[in-house]
């Protein structure tokens, strides 16, 4: 199976493009919108009927080094009485993001783009019921 | 920059931090090779805080196409299938990194960009403000 490639010879190259060695791409890791802040509603992870916890994964050879992952606290959902209702399901909501991986081969260093699946939070869903004949 | 461990046997010229500009292999490694079969794509309909998905396309971005969530209701769907306004549907937002062609239209020159996307919605108890 082919691994997707970023960039391509398919593109007409404008004159202003920087020269890039074959098989690689130039990546500026000075992030655009670096200081943008998430304006998510306050502590929704605790107020949700499908609450979740956060875990920070840290990897010094990854950029960004910190990636936050959510885990649903319950299998069921929290009802109006604050009790777990197992007739409903808490399920993870996921989103793909890109990271840069730094690889050491002997004394040389190379960089690789990676797609990483991040669990962002949880939502409460009605279960799919499979009827057995 | 990000400090990384240095192989003690290597020359000291190696920078401990990520440099500002790097040359990256064109092949993207996929950490999520086995898409979780339990990961359903119909949660947007089955959720008590259902959402619609909107297509956003930008050829100068990698990925070019991103599907964004918008909550269908202000309230949440109760057991009877009606909207309950005592609860709130709110978007779950995430900052993700994408690549932006820089300069524009260049095939193999990018800059990282942080964008905020709404991934889905969740049902929350509202914050009640009591007026004195």
């Amino acid at each position: 199976r082919k691994i997707p490639k970023v960039g391509h010879t398919f593109f007409q190259k404008p004159e202003s493009c920087p020269p890039v060695p074959g098989g690689s791409m130039k990546l500026d890791i000075g992030i655009i919108n670096e200081n943008q802040r998430v304006s998510m509603s306050r502590n929704i992870e605790s107020r949700s009927t499908s609450p979740w916890n956060y875990t920070v994964t840290w990897d010094p050879n990854r950029y960004p080094s910190e990636v936050v992952q959510a885990q649903c606290r319950n299998l069921g959902c929290i009802n109006a009485q604050g009790k777990e209702d197992i007739s409903m399901n808490s399920v993870p909501i996921q989103q793909e993001t890109l990271v840069v991986r730094r690889k050491h081969q002997g004394c040389s260093v190379s960089f690789q783009l990676e797609k990483v699946l991040v669990t962002v939070g949880c939502t409460c869903v009605t279960p799919v019921i499979h009827h057995v004949q | 920059g990000i400090t990384i461990p240095r192989n003690p046997g290597c020359p000291n010229s190696e920078d401990k931090n990520f440099p500002r500009t790097v040359m990256v292999n064109l092949n993207i490694h996929n950490r999520n090779t086995n898409t979780n079969p339990k990961r359903s794509s119909d949660y947007y309909n089955r959720s008590t805080s259902p959402w619609n998905l909107h297509r956003n396309e930008d050829p100068e971005r990698y990925p070019s196409v991103i599907w964004e969530a918008k909550c269908r209701h202000l309230g949440c769907i109760n057991a009877d299938g009606n909207v309950d306004y005592h609860m709130n549907s709110v978007p779950i937002q995430q900052e993700i990194l994408v690549l932006r062609r820089e300069p524009p239209h260049c095939p193999n020159s990018f800059r990282l960009e942080k964008i905020l996307v709404s991934v889905g919605c969740t049902c929350v108890t509202p914050i009640v403000h009591h007026v004195a």
Epitope: F11 | N30, S41, S64
Partner: antibody, heavy 121, light 106 residues
Framework: QVQLQQSGAELVRPGTSVTLSCKAS????????IHWIKQTPAQVLEWIGV????????LHNPKFDGKATLTADKSSRTAYMELRSLTSEDSAVYYC??????????????WGQGTSVTVSS | QIVLTQSPAIMSAFPGEKVTMTCSAS?????MCWYQQKPGTSPKRWIC???KLASGVPVRFSGSGSGTSYSLTINSMETEDAATYYC?????????FGGGTKVEIK
């Protein structure tokens, strides 16, 4: 190699519904959207809409709202299009085609072989 | 919706002859794709984002244009180029196709 295998020809009665399928192989199914195209007997091509197997998102040409429902099943790597309340106007060849979400300049790069739908009483 | 008008609707050319067909959009668009279709087969991606040839497309084909006016050119017509060529825009929903230009060999 990349393949989009579409279901066989359909001969259906007016007023009924039909579901066409498009089974994908040879690539990572969730990296691509599936678009559906109608080709009329006059050889006119019309874009029906798109489904994203990853998120479940769909977008329709307003002309086909209420006519076509697009879905995809990740586990079987199959996209479906249901056509409802069929009339003779719906007699056509229907194609599924893939569209790379990561770099859109590829366009619709692989097409299924097409499914012929004939609506006749 | 954006209407794409292709002209001519039908044309014929001798082998070796230069062939140009046009696609006019009712509103300005950023990119144009072209698809080739032969009788009894599915359309094939031919040129995308105005001028980028799909893999396997002979270099005698070229695409150009901007705004509302786009064209596809065959520098030196060959027998295998006889087909119908459709332009397609994806700058605005719904995506639309032109009515096609049928190219025949003399």
């Amino acid at each position: 190699q990349v393949q989009l295998q579409q279901s066989g020809a359909e001969l259906v009665r007016p007023g009924t519904s039909v579901t066409l399928s498009c089974k994908a192989s040879g690539y990572r199914f969730t990296d691509y959207e599936i678009h559906w195209i109608k080709q009329t007997p006059a050889q006119v091509l019309e874009w029906i809409g798109v489904t994203d197997p990853e998120s479940g998102g769909t977008l329709h040409n307003p002309k086909f709202d209420g006519k076509a429902t697009l879905t995809a099943d990740k586990s079987s790597r199959t996209a479906y299009m249901e056509l409802r309340s069929l009339t003779s106007e719906d007699s056509a060849v229907y194609y599924c085609t893939r569209y790379y979400k990561y770099e859109s300049f590829y366009g619709m790069d692989y097409w299924g072989q097409g499914t012929s739908v004939t609506v006749s009483s | 919706q954006i209407v794409l008008t292709q002209s001519p609707a039908i044309m014929s050319a001798f082998p070796g002859e230069k062939v140009t067909m046009t696609c006019s959009a009712s509103s300005s668009i950023s990119y144009m794709c072209w698809y080739q279709q032969k009788p009894g087969t599915s359309p094939k991606r031919w040129i995308c984002d105005t001028s980028k040839l799909a893999s396997g497309v002979p270099v005698r084909f070229s695409g150009s244009g901007s705004g509302t006016s786009y064209s596809l050119t065959i520098n030196s017509m060959e027998t295998e180029d006889a087909a119908t060529y459709y332009c397609q825009q994806r700058s605005s929903y719904p995506w639309t196709f032109g009515g096609g230009t049928k190219v025949e060999i003399k």
